[in-house]
């Protein structure tokens, strides 16, 4: 049965051009056998497919071998257009990106998209952030009731293009000051101009709370 | 007529060496490729391994460590070591032969030998 | 390793009826795929190659169909000389492997 297969098949072998570099050929079926080397791809135009033997395999496809079996497999990563092997790719689909192999919609943390090739490069290395430094204003650690308190971390490894920009290495926040008052009583300009202004709003208020009290009683022994 | 004949011990003791020969008839062994296929008591088929028309060899990674195959192209034959065989060896061992992707694969089989792995 | 399993595991089914027998992959294994026959006491004889390619000699109530990991083979009108045991193989991969057979008796 099979050996019907296999001798019908050499017959037409020579003047075919899709028969190159087959050691069996069918003008229905293609090439079934491939010279040693080149690689077996199964090409398919609608309902119909027929084998080919190649040199190397076409986009989409990689060539995967066995000891003396070449054949072209298809790409079967996720979003990738070419890859090397089963489960490295090599080009992503447009709009993804290349990372090891593999294919992102975005990249990875700790990774920065490379527009120009699509592809997920180094991106800045920023160390831990440190301890909240201690509360303070105008360089003074009292003296206020708010102040600001600042936090920093280092870059351990810039990024391979100086076009990704490093996250932020300081950042601030608001806070209260443990010590309102300084130690020794002395208050800044500020602080003596706001307790002169309260003295002199306590007086008004005082005056004008007598002067209130004057005309109600004059109007009373009246 | 391409024809496979398998040969060999029907009874091998547990921990000793299986060793069978195909012997081919039809086409030579030095085109395509020259498989061993086994078939369980349960009726599952397991492929163990090939070896091509240039000599070499592909085995399952569950046997690599204790299969081998060979061939004597002189003799138009081909063999089967399996080492350190257990009752689990227990079946019955074809050879078989396909010849690339584009054509059939195993399209000739021996009649298969039963091979009984027990002490 | 590449998973093929196939369904039903048994059927009964009577002269003249259409049957289909199913193998599933674990993965897409691109057409790569063969239906054998297996009588009792006799060796496996290969039906169809590369999903749907019929063997000379093999009666064209034989099909085969599918793509991805679902394929399926067809006799159209089952003869008493169709009964044995089918299995399905995928030979997208090394190591290649065979589904677990579909033991066919007529009714």
């Known amino acids: 049965q099979g050996n019907r297969w296999r001798r019908s098949k050499r017959a037409s072998y020579v003047s075919n051009p899709i028969c190159k570099g087959c050691l069996s050929c069918s003008k229905d079926n293609g090439c079934s056998r491939c010279q040693q080397k080149l690689f077996f791809f199964l090409r398919r135009e609608g309902m119909r497919q027929y084998g080919e033997c190649l040199h190397s395999c076409p986009s989409g496809y990689y060539g995967h071998r066995a000891p003396d079996m070449n054949r072209c497999a298809r790409c079967r990563i996720e979003n990738c257009d070419s890859c090397f092997s089963k489960d490295f790719c090599t080009k992503c689909k447009v709009g993804f990106y290349l990372h090891r192999g593999r294919c992102f919609d975005e990249c990875p943390d700790g990774f920065a998209p490379l527009e120009e090739t699509m592809e997920c490069v180094e991106g800045c290395e920023v160390g831990h952030w440190s301890e909240w430094g201690t509360c303070s204003r105008n360089n003074r650690t009292c003296g206020f009731k708010w102040g600001l308190e600042t936090r920093t971390r280092q870059i351990v490894k810039k990024p391979v293009k100086d076009t990704i920009l490093c996250p932020t290495i300081a950042e601030s926040r608001r806070c209260k000051m443990t010590m309102r008052h300084c130690p020794g009583g002395k208050r800044t300009p500020k602080a003596k101009e706001k307790r002169n202004k309260k003295k002199k709003r306590k007086l008004i208020e005082r005056a004008q709370e007598q002067h209130s009290v004057f005309l109600a009683t004059d109007r009373a022994n009246q | 007529e391409v024809q496979l004949q398998e040969s060999g011990p029907s009874l091998v003791k547990p921990s000793q060496t299986l060793s069978l020969t195909c012997s081919v008839t039809?086409?030579?062994?030095?085109?395509?490729?020259w498989s061993w296929i086994r078939k369980f008591p349960g009726n599952k088929l397991e492929f163990m391994g090939y070896?091509?028309?240039?000599?070499?060899?592909y085995y399952i990674p569950s046997l690599k460590s204790r299969v081998s195959i060979t061939r004597d192209t002189s003799k138009n034959q081909y063999y089967l070591q399996l080492n350190s065989v257990t009752t689990e060896d227990t079946a019955t061992y074809y050879c078989?032969?396909?010849?690339?992707?584009?054509?059939?694969?195993?399209?000739?089989w021996g009649q298969g030998t039963l091979v009984t792995v027990s002490s | 390793d590449i998973k093929m399993t196939q369904s039903p595991s048994s059927m009964y089914a009577s002269l003249g009826e259409r049957v289909t027998i199913t193998c599933k992959a674990s993965q897409d294994i691109d057409s790569y795929l063969s239906w054998f026959q297996q009588k009792p006491g006799k060796s496996p004889k290969t039906l169809i190659y590369l999903t749907n390619r019929l063997i000379d000699g093999v009666p064209s109530r034989f099909s085969g169909s599918g793509s991805g990991q679902d394929y399926s083979l067809t006799i159209n009108s089952l003869e008493y000389e169709d009964m044995g045991i089918y299995y399905c193989?995928?030979?997208?991969?090394?190591?290649?492997?065979f589904g677990a057979g579909t033991r066919l008796e007529i009714k």
């Open positions: 039809g086409d030579s062994i030095t085109s395509g490729y």
């Open positions: 078989a032969t396909y010849h690339g992707y584009g054509g059939p694969w195993f399209a000739y």
């Open positions: 070896i091509s028309f240039s000599g070499k060899t």
């Open positions: 193989l995928q030979y997208d991969e090394f190591p290649v492997t």
